[in-house]
């Protein structure tokens, strides 16, 4: 089934500004999450990041990333998470099916989930920004 656009595509410089803000917010979130001692990154969770078969700025898996951040919000009420979700909303240009993510039940596993996804999200925003800037450079050459 095809998906209907729900808002106009943003110019790539708008997208870059949003991703720059997300990169900054992701670092704040990670810094705060890392203050919880004795929690290790888990191999059980993978945050989708960039799609190899799409061009910037449409290559960011924003709906899936947002779904993971919404799951974190169920476990952690830091206001920076709300701000991240608001920015991710701006990067979703089409109706996309909600990604279903199961929330860990064990408290320690919840902490591992938050740390792992926060770390991957921070790395993902670095990659997204690189892909946007390199895409912009290619477009000008």
């Amino acid at each position: 089934s095809h998906t209907l656009p729900v808002r106009l595509l943003r110019p790539s410089d708008d997208v870059q500004k949003i991703v720059e803000e997300l990169q900054s917010l992701s670092k704040m979130l990670l810094k705060d999450v890392e203050e919880e001692k004795g929690v290790l990154v888990s191999q059980n969770y993978t945050l989708p990041c960039l799609s190899p078969d799409a061009q910037p700025p449409n290559n960011i898996h924003s709906p899936a990333i947002r779904a993971y951040l919404k799951t974190i919000r169920q476990l952690d009420n830091k206001s920076v998470i709300d701000e991240i979700i608001e920015h991710l909303d701006k990067l979703i240009f089409q109706d996309a099916p909600e990604t279903n993510i199961s929330v860990p039940t064990d408290t320690h596993e919840c902490k591992r989930f938050i740390l792992t996804i926060s770390q991957q999200f921070s790395e993902c925003m670095d990659l997204a920004l690189k892909s946007l800037t390199s895409g912009a450079q290619q477009a000008t050459t």
Partner: antibody, heavy 124, light 110 residues
């Protein structure tokens, strides 16, 4: 043992100002909680005033009625949160509690901590 | 944002089952705590995250609910349970904020 100790309460005239302090002992400020001020007028219920997040961003949330007259701030080096109260009125007479609340699943119920409160009396 | 707590007061006997409800004006994602308060003392945490029992709290206290509707139940009221009970949301996100219910005073019947 973790505790919060409020100070700075006392008798103040209507229109006056007061600064309350909430000193944390037995623990240091960390990102995974909020510190809030709550008050309780004599014989009345608990009333939330304002919260500040302890983390990279010092986010603040005020009760709508508290905006403008009340200001929360923190000094991480002193492990202290402050409440500046201006233009005080008789109806601000209450016990003012400082409280720590969890930012989610972190440390569970150990993050819920209340001070004993400090009495503020606004009267001429 | 509002938390509506009911009833505002109730009279009960030792051994009774007591239920107090708390309704939020919008979903609070289970960021709800229940407290017991006695005169001259700060509130004591009973339940957090809607249903989790705080350490050292007797198992006769339980919490349930999700979304906007929450309940505190005391399965068998004991003499030391006569006090005032408050619900509280402690959601830090920018759209909800914080707040307390109006309180429920539990007194001895008769």
């Amino acid at each position: 043992q973790s505790q919060l100790v409020e100070s700075g309460g006392g008798l103040v005239q209507p229109g006056g100002s007061l600064r309350l302090s909430c000193a944390a002992s037995g623990f240091s400020f960390s990102a995974n909680y909020w510190i809030c001020w709550v008050r309780q007028a004599p014989g009345k219920g608990l009333e939330w005033i304002v919260c500040i997040s302890i983390g990279s961003r010092a986010d603040t949330y005020y009760a709508p009625w508290a905006k403008g007259r009340f200001t929360i701030s923190k000094d991480n080096s002193k492990n202290t949160v402050y409440l500046q109260m201006n233009s005080l009125r008789a109806e601000d007479t209450a016990v003012y509690f400082c409280a720590r609340f969890s930012s989610g699943i972190y440390d569970l119920d150990r993050f819920f901590l209340w001070g004993q409160g400090t009495l503020v009396t606004v009267s001429s | 944002f509002q938390l509506t707590q009911s009833p505002s007061s109730l009279s009960a006997s030792v051994g009774d089952r007591v239920t107090i409800t708390c309704q939020a004006s919008q979903s609070i994602d289970s960021w709800l705590a229940w407290y017991q308060q006695k005169p001259g003392k700060p509130p004591k945490l009973l339940i957090y995250q809607a249903s989790k029992l705080a350490s050292g709290v007797p198992s006769r206290f339980s919490g349930s609910g999700s979304g906007t509707d929450y309940t505190l139940t005391i399965s068998s009221l004991q003499p030391e349970d006569f006090a005032t009970y408050y619900c509280q949301t402690y959601y830090g996100g920018g759209h909800i904020g914080w707040g307390f219910g109006t309180g429920t005073k539990v007194t001895v019947l008769g």
